[in-house]
């Protein structure tokens, strides 16, 4: 049903869904702090632009009685229940921030007449791609997939002279929300990744993974998995690994690899870690004091969601345009705005662009070193270390199929 929006006459409200089921187990208080910090910045920016308006946030909490799994499994109904609550209260803002779970975002988008923009910190799955009024401020699965295909095909780097066309994907069903959808995208038979690879098999059992490490008859030397180093260690332990195995560990929202005192454990020597470039330190900000490094990206996405709204509000007000229009709802894409941590770029479909960083463990220093960067906005790789001190033979990445000659 059509809900009137609190979004005119100099008063602009943001509806923030505070869902019990979330992509990251973050206390709602921390997200509230992030939103409030964002509001302060937006008010300052609007004031500096000579726009004398009021911007507030309304936090919509679910009762948590029915949907209490805490993860995203029961988020579909929770999202719709919250929308019903908004509808009953006749209290909708200019923009909806949240939800973060792919299930709930997909369902809410499907089941509502979306004449307002929706900003999500999460919604990683392919089912949330190409949604006209949805903006995603954390790297979605599509971006990961494009990197992997680009990297697989690359054969003109000093350290990667073979194109790859095969892979194993380890996916045991216990993954975090981001990893679940990243791996889900790689598994999907109709996805770009599957389409571009000649061979791909999903390993679902620990034993399957462990057996592949030394299996002479394996069909690929490359294994993709998602999680942190500890996750890998639980699985791999100190088992021997064939010398031409390459494990790609996707761990996007973890900037601990860049900390000065971090030493790579020995079991990481056959591993390339894919992560995001580290942001400027957020440690001094009031909202992030209680956050672990892996949670900062989530809270930061909420904060940046507020700043994005402020950016669009400023543009529309300066141009004398109405906020409660489809034009406003569809405008949150193909732009760069001033985020909390520097410029943030959104692609044509409202998805955040970022710099992914591929790290390796130096056999000399036992430190994580940057091998290359990948700009998701232009789909281009930039090699950083041309002479990496790899564990692999000749300091080059092996072929993906043992015994196959140059491609």
């Amino acid at each position: 049903s059509q809900v009137s929006q609190n979004c005119h006459n100099g008063s602009y409200e943001i509806s923030v869904l505070m869902m019990g089921n979330s992509a990251f187990a973050e206390p709602l208080k921390n997200l509230e702090d992030a939103v409030n910090e964002g509001l302060e910045i937006v008010r300052g920016r609007l004031q500096n632009a000579g726009l004398n308006v009021t911007v507030n946030a309304t936090f919509m909490y679910s009762d948590g009685l029915i949907h209490n799994s805490g993860d995203c499994r029961s988020s579909t109904c929770e999202g719709l229940d919250l929308l019903r609550k908004i509808s009953n209260a006749q209290r909708m803002g200019c923009v909806l921030i949240g939800p973060s779970c792919t299930y709930s975002t997909f369902q809410m988008y499907l089941d509502t007449e979306l004449s307002y923009p929706m900003i999500s910190a999460g919604s990683f799955g392919l089912s949330c791609d190409y949604k006209e009024t949805l903006t995603r401020l954390m790297s979605p699965a599509r971006k990961l997939m494009y990197f992997l295909v680009n990297f697989w095909k690359t054969n003109d780097l000093p350290f990667k002279t073979y194109s790859w066309s095969t892979s194993y994907v380890y996916k045991n069903g216990t993954e975090t929300e981001d990893c679940f959808w990243y791996l889900n995208a790689l598994e999907a038979s109709v996805s770009y990744f599957s389409h571009e690879l000649g061979f791909k098999v999903v390993l679902r059992q620990d034993k399957e993974f462990q057996d592949i490490l030394m299996d002479h008859n394996r069909k690929s030397n490359v294994i993709i998995m998602c999680g942190g180093p500890e996750f890998l260690y639980k699985l791999k332990g100190d088992r021997a690994v064939a010398e031409d195995i390459v494990i790609i560990l996707v761990d996007l929202f973890n900037d601990q690899y860049f900390e000065d005192n971090v030493t790579a454990p020995d079991y990481m020597k056959n591993v390339l870690v894919l992560t995001l470039s580290p942001g400027n330190s957020l440690l001094n900000s009031s909202f992030s004091r209680n956050l672990s490094p892996t949670k900062r990206d989530f809270a930061l996405a909420y904060l940046n969601g507020i700043l994005l709204f402020g950016h669009m509000l400023k543009i529309f007000l300066e141009n004398g345009e109405n906020i409660t229009t489809p034009k406003f709802a569809h405008a949150f894409r193909n732009l760069t705005f001033e985020g909390y941590d520097g410029p943030v770029t959104l692609d044509d479909w409202g998805d955040v662009d970022s710099t992914m960083v591929l790290l390796y463990t130096s056999v000399d220093t036992k430190k994580y070193k940057v091998l290359l960067t990948y700009d998701t906005h232009v789909n281009k790789t930039y090699p950083v270390d041309m002479s990496p001190t790899f564990t692999w033979k000749n300091s080059k990445l092996p072929n993906d199929i043992t015994g196959r000659g140059p491609q």
């Epitope: 000093p158 770029t345 940057v370 700009d375 002479s387």
Partner: antibody
Framework: EVQLVQPGAEVKKPGSSVKVSCKAS????????ISWVRQAPGQGLEWMGR????????NYAQKFQGRVTITADKSTSTAYMELSSLRSEDTAVYFC???????????WGQGTLVTVSS | QSELTQPASVSGSPGQSITISCTGT?????????VSWYQQHPGKVPKLMIH???HRPSGVSNRFSGSRSGNTASLTISGLQAEDEADYFC??????????FGTGTKVTVL
């Protein structure tokens, strides 16, 4: 399309330092490198060093090691090149340029003429 | 290696083809695909003409082509035109994780 904007000119005394800025407008510094290249009057191009702003990783030409410092501010999309202990031979146009691939500079700033004179 | 070696000048008549060489070592030109060519008109900013030995950026005329043999890279300009008169510089990535430019070649259209 990104453009690199540099100040027009600087006049410095021998022994002093100069800090030249290079701001990306119409885009961000992104994940590429920013190189600094100088050209003395009537001379060829000379590579001084580079930075990958998103990571803060720098490399310097041996000739300038210890005398040049390249930095970047991601939040303002600005790169900086500081050259110390200036001498008259440092009089040159200083360009910043974006590396879209290593040693492949596809976007250049207009250049800053630094004159070192007593 | 402080600089890559280029001929000081090359000339040709309109419509002709000319080739500029750029000689280095196996630690730079011969060792990596990262060899580029730049055109610079007097008082202007250098313009990227070729990257990765032989790749032309969009917007660059297909009269410009690049190649490499051993430690020498070459830039060929076919169908020489008056506006091609400029200085040309090669550059390469080096094994010391640096870049190096060539000495520069002045192209004159007769």
């Amino acid at each position: 399309e990104v453009q690199l904007v540099q100040p027009g000119a600087e006049v410095k005394k021998p022994g002093s330092s100069v800090k030249v800025s290079c701001k990306a407008s119409g885009g961000t510094l992104s994940s590429y490198a920013i190189s600094w290249v100088r050209q003395a009057p009537g001379q060829g191009l000379e590579w001084m060093g580079r930075i990958i702003p998103i990571l803060g990783i720098t490399n310097y030409a041996q000739k300038f090691q210890g005398r040049v410092t390249i930095t970047a501010d991601k939040s303002t999309s600005t790169a900086y090149m500081e050259l110390s202990s200036l001498r008259s031979e440092d009089t040159a146009v200083y360009f910043c340029a974006r590396d879209q691939r290593p040693a492949s500079m596809d976007v250049w700033g207009q250049g800053t003429l630094v004159t070192v004179s007593s | 290696q402080s600089e890559l070696t280029q001929p000081a000048s090359v000339s040709g008549s309109p419509g002709q083809s000319i080739t500029i060489s750029c000689t280095g070592t196996s630690s730079d030109v011969g060792g990596y695909i990262y060899v580029s060519w730049y055109q610079q008109h007097p008082g202007k900013v250098p313009k990227l003409m070729i990257h990765d030995v032989s790749h032309r950026p969009s917007g660059v005329s297909n009269r410009f082509s690049g190649s490499r043999s051993g430690n020498t890279a070459s830039l060929t300009i076919s169908g020489l035109q008056a506006e091609d008169e400029a200085d040309y510089f090669c550059s390469s990535y080096t094994s010391s994780n640096n870049y190096v430019f060539g000495t520069g070649t002045k192209v004159t259209v007769l």
